[in-house]
Structure formats: C-alpha cells, structure tokens
C-alpha cells in the first residue's frame, strides 16, 4: 500500500533485468501497490511504451508497446 511506512525505494529497479520486458515488471509490481500518473519529468522516459508510476516504490515503470522490450521499451523484440 502506498501509505505504508516502508521505504519508498525511491529509484528502484525498473525491470528485473535490462533484458526483461518492462510489462512483466508492472505485473509484478501490482502485488506491492497501485499505479498513478507518471510525474511530468518522466514524459520522455519510455521510448516505445507508456509510463506508470509505482506508488509503493515511487519510481517510474514502462509498459512496452507490442514488439518492444527493455527498461525503456527501447529495443525491438526480435522474437515478436
């Protein structure tokens, strides 16, 4: 829950690994808390996808468009 007293992990891991699709990370994050609009300062963070702010971690996360992977949805998924 976003109002818990745990550390906000203010800039934690955006994806489990640089090779991992960020969409998987947001699915994981749902167990930790909900999402809010990304702060305006991250409007250019996700290259081929949309930004979501993980409330419990206070950090941005990218949900990649189909066919893109990477922390910032910056790479074409060759297996797509």
């Amino acid at each position: 829950d976003g109002n818990s007293t745990r550390s906000p992990e203010t800039n934690g891991l955006l994806c489990g690994d640089p090779e991992e699709n960020c969409a998987a990370t947001t699915t994981q994050s749902k167990r930790k808390g909900h999402f809010s609009r990304c702060p305006k300062q991250y409007k250019h963070y996700c290259i081929k996808g949309r930004c979501r702010f993980v409330v419990a971690e206070q950090t941005p996360s990218c949900v990649c468009d189909e066919g893109y992977i990477g922390a910032r949805c910056e790479r074409v998924d060759l297996f797509y």
Epitope: G2, S7, N11, G12, S36, Q41, V55, P60, A71, E74
Partner: antibody, heavy 116, light 106 residues
C-alpha cells in the same frame, strides 16, 4: 548500511572544470537512480541532475544544462558529475543522493568553491 | 518551472508544541511531494513522501497531508531533536524545493 561518499570538491577559478565522484556502498548500486543536489552556503536545496539505473536517461536543471554532465560506472559503484565552465553561482556543497524523484539517502557532501 | 512556497520562513516553538508548516505549489502536483529535515552541517533526511506517507524509521509524530497545490507538515509534539530546517520538494515536473522553514527554540 547505505553509504554515499562524495569527493573531488575544491577551489576552482571561474571558467574552470571539476569532476566530482560519489562512491556508493551498502546497496545494489546498479538498481537505483542517483541524483546530485547542491546547496549554496546559507541557502536552500537545489536539484542539479539525475541518472537512471543503467545510465541511459539523464536530466539537468536549467541552471547547469550544457555545462554539467552526469554519468555512472556500475562496475565501480560510482557516480560522477563533470562540471565545466564553472561560475561563481555554482559555489555550493554538492550532495549525491539515492533517487530520481525522492532522495532517501544522502552523502555528506563536498564543497565546490568557484572564485578568482 | 513549478515554484514551491513555504510558510512561515521561520518559527519559534517550545518542546511539546504542535507545529505546522505549509507548502504551496504554483501548479497542481497531485501528491508528488516530499518533506525533509536538515540540521546544520548535515545532509537532509527524508521524512515524508507522496505527501502523506511516513518514511521508514521516522517517528510517528511527523505527518503530512494535502494534494494538488496545498500541503502541510505537522509535528504533533515537538521534541528537542526536531529543531532544524524543513524543506518541501515537488517531484512532478523535475525536482524543486521550497525555501525552507527554520524551527527554532522559543
């Protein structure tokens, strides 16, 4: 425990350059965004720059854009700030802080003095 | 740029007092606001994030409230170690701090 240790500050003439370093320990450095925040003597806090976990995304305050460059070496658990074309108004204590949005851990700071 | 205006700039209070510091953003920032405490010669310490969430390890006498443009930090019963300068910080449109509120001993 989380530790951030800045170094590289000192006295530099206007127009000169300086490179600050921030050595991190006590956490998995490569998983975290890191920022530089400064504080002029007797003044308030001013965010300077941040860099994402992998070093692919950076942003700067307007006051330093084009003059300062943030970078990181995850293999060395170290953050850097290359400061060029320094001005008197850059005189401040420079802190590295864990976070891009919020700053949950801070170093002790390093003093940069720009004066002739 | 979003400007953050804190009030008052300083205040005098006694141990046990209830202290309230306000912070106003020049435009709406939802709940993207943090509060920090700084003592002379030391680095700031995060107290509150997301406007009202207490950072781990911070005493429960500290609380935050507000959303949009108006925010408040409250210390329910001031302790000797709470005399310090407090800063608000918005993190919606990059990161900007208020000018600080110095809490002094009356």
């Amino acid at each position: 425990q989380v530790q951030l240790l800045e170094s590289g500050g000192g006295l530099v003439q206007p127009g000169g350059s300086l490179r600050l370093s921030c050595a991190a320990s006590g956490f998995t450095f490569s998983r975290y965004w890191i920022s530089w925040v400064r504080q002029a003597p007797g003044k308030g806090l001013e965010w300077v720059s941040y860099i994402d976990s992998w070093g692919s995304y950076t942003n700067y305050a307007d006051s330093v854009k084009g003059r300062f460059t943030i970078s990181r070496d995850n293999s060395k658990n170290t953050l850097y700030l290359q400061m060029n074309s320094l001005r008197a108004e850059d005189t401040a204590v420079y802190y590295c802080a864990r976070g891009g949005s919020l700053f949950d851990y801070w170093g002790q700071g390093t003093l940069v003095t720009v004066s002739s | 740029d979003i400007q953050m205006t804190q009030s008052p700039s300083s205040l005098s209070a006694s141990v046990g007092d209830r202290v309230t510091i306000t912070c106003r953003a020049s435009q709406g920032i939802i709940s993207y606001l943090g509060w920090y405490q700084q003592k002379p010669g030391k680095a700031p310490k995060l107290l509150i994030y997301a406007a009202s969430s207490l950072q781990s390890g911070v005493p429960s006498r500290f609380s935050g409230s507000g959303s949009g443009t108006d925010f408040t930090l409250t210390i329910s019963s001031l302790q000797p170690e709470d005399f310090a300068t407090y800063y608000c910080q918005q993190y919606d449109d990059f990161d900007t701090f208020g000018q600080g509120t110095k809490v002094e001993i009356k």
